[in-house]
């Protein structure tokens, strides 16, 4: 079976101030079993912006139910956007560990630019 | 329930150090980012530091910049204040506070620590 | 850097009669403003987020509106123990978070 890849068909999202961002992501297997997290920026400094398995994301919302076992599909919806939003999230992929989970692979990323709102 | 308790503060003399520590509990503390905010003997809040979920990414108030570090122990739950080269106007009670999202308010305080800088 | 000045510094009000606190930041922070509470001797508490959401467990006499760079925290008929300074605190800019100088509110 081919390795699982982590899928971010859009390189770039505009989004005006104060609406809904979507960010698509996909995997192509359910193998290895583990969570989705969603970060904002790369490296030691990256924003946890969604973790599947723990956590209230109260701004965040899951496109596909992701507790359906053949689910792949891990696209998010972030509602009122402001310009600290803008930036490029990663779709990570974690391989169930313990005790805790192992960063498996990341998609290439989307960046979201925000766009100001009209006044 | 939410809980933020903070430990360390006293007296000190300027030039001297000081850190404080915030112990958090009641929530996944690894997801959130935390902040110090302080507020100087009747005066308002002033906002010292911010630092991210994974602990990697760290924020300043100009005030503080290259004398305070903001760190975390995730496996310990617990949020922690550098402070160096304490001056009179560093005297304050310091709250450590929880985001209510990476990029949001401030959800829930802590009692506070009060840090006296004096000779 | 967002600037948000408060007013009045200092608010008398009976107890019953309506309080009206007002926040105006120096540049547009579209609905990302909460208020907080702070009593004498005490943490301060999240009262609004969002410009006019009420947190968990505060009393619906407490009301928040506003939007862009005006924005007003209404008490509908203040109690004895909602003597406190509020401040309200901007989050669509930051670094660095920005909070207002404070409107200290007295029951009569």
């Known amino acids: 079976e081919e390795e699982l890849q982590v899928i971010q068909p859009d390189k770039s999202v505009l989004v005006a101030a104060g609406e809904t961002a979507t960010l698509r992501c996909t995997a192509t297997s359910l193998i290895p079993v583990g969570p989705i997290q969603w970060f904002r920026g790369a490296g030691p400094g990256r924003e946890l912006i969604y973790n599947q398995k723990e956590g209230h994301f109260p701004r965040v919302t899951t496109v596909s139910d992701l507790t359906k076992r053949n689910n792949m599909d891990f696209s998010i919806r972030i509602g009122n956007i402001t310009p600290a939003d803008a930036g490029t999230y990663y779709c990570v992929k974690f391989r169930k560990g313990s005790p805790d989970d192992v960063e498996f692979k990341s998609g290439a990323g989307t960046e979201l630019s925000v766009r100001a709102k009209p006044s | 329930d939410v809980q933020l308790v903070e430990s360390g503060g006293g007296v000190v003399r300027p030039g001297e150090s000081l850190r404080l520590s915030c112990a958090a509990s009641g929530f996944s503390f690894r997801s959130y980012a935390m902040n110090w905010v302080r507020q100087a003997p009747g005066e308002g809040l002033e906002w010292v530091s911010r630092i991210n979920s994974g602990g990697g990414g760290t924020d300043y108030a100009d005030s503080v910049k290259g004398r305070f570090t903001i760190s975390r122990d995730n496996s310990k739950n617990t949020l922690y204040l550098q402070m160096n080269s304490l001056r009179a106007e560093d005297t304050a009670v310091y709250y450590c506070?929880?985001?209510?999202?990476?990029?949001?308010?401030?959800?829930?305080w802590g009692l506070g620590a009060l840090v006296t800088v004096s000779s | 850097e967002t600037v948000l000045t408060q007013s009045p510094a200092t608010l008398s009000v009976s107890p019953g009669e309506r309080a009206t606190l007002s926040c105006r930041a120096s540049q547009t922070v579209g609905s990302k403003l909460a208020w907080h509470q702070q009593k004498p001797g005490q943490a301060p508490r999240l009262l609004i987020y969002d410009a006019s959401n009420r947190a968990t467990g505060i009393p619906d006499r407490f009301s928040g509106s506003g939007s862009g760079t005006d924005f007003t925290l209404t008490i509908s008929s203040p109690q004895t123990e909602d003597s406190a300074v509020y401040y309200c605190q901007q989050y669509y800019y930051w670094p660095p978070y920005r909070f207002g100088g404070g409107t200290k509110v007295e029951i009569k």
């Open positions: 506070a929880k985001q209510y999202d990476w990029n949001s308010f401030f959800d829930y």
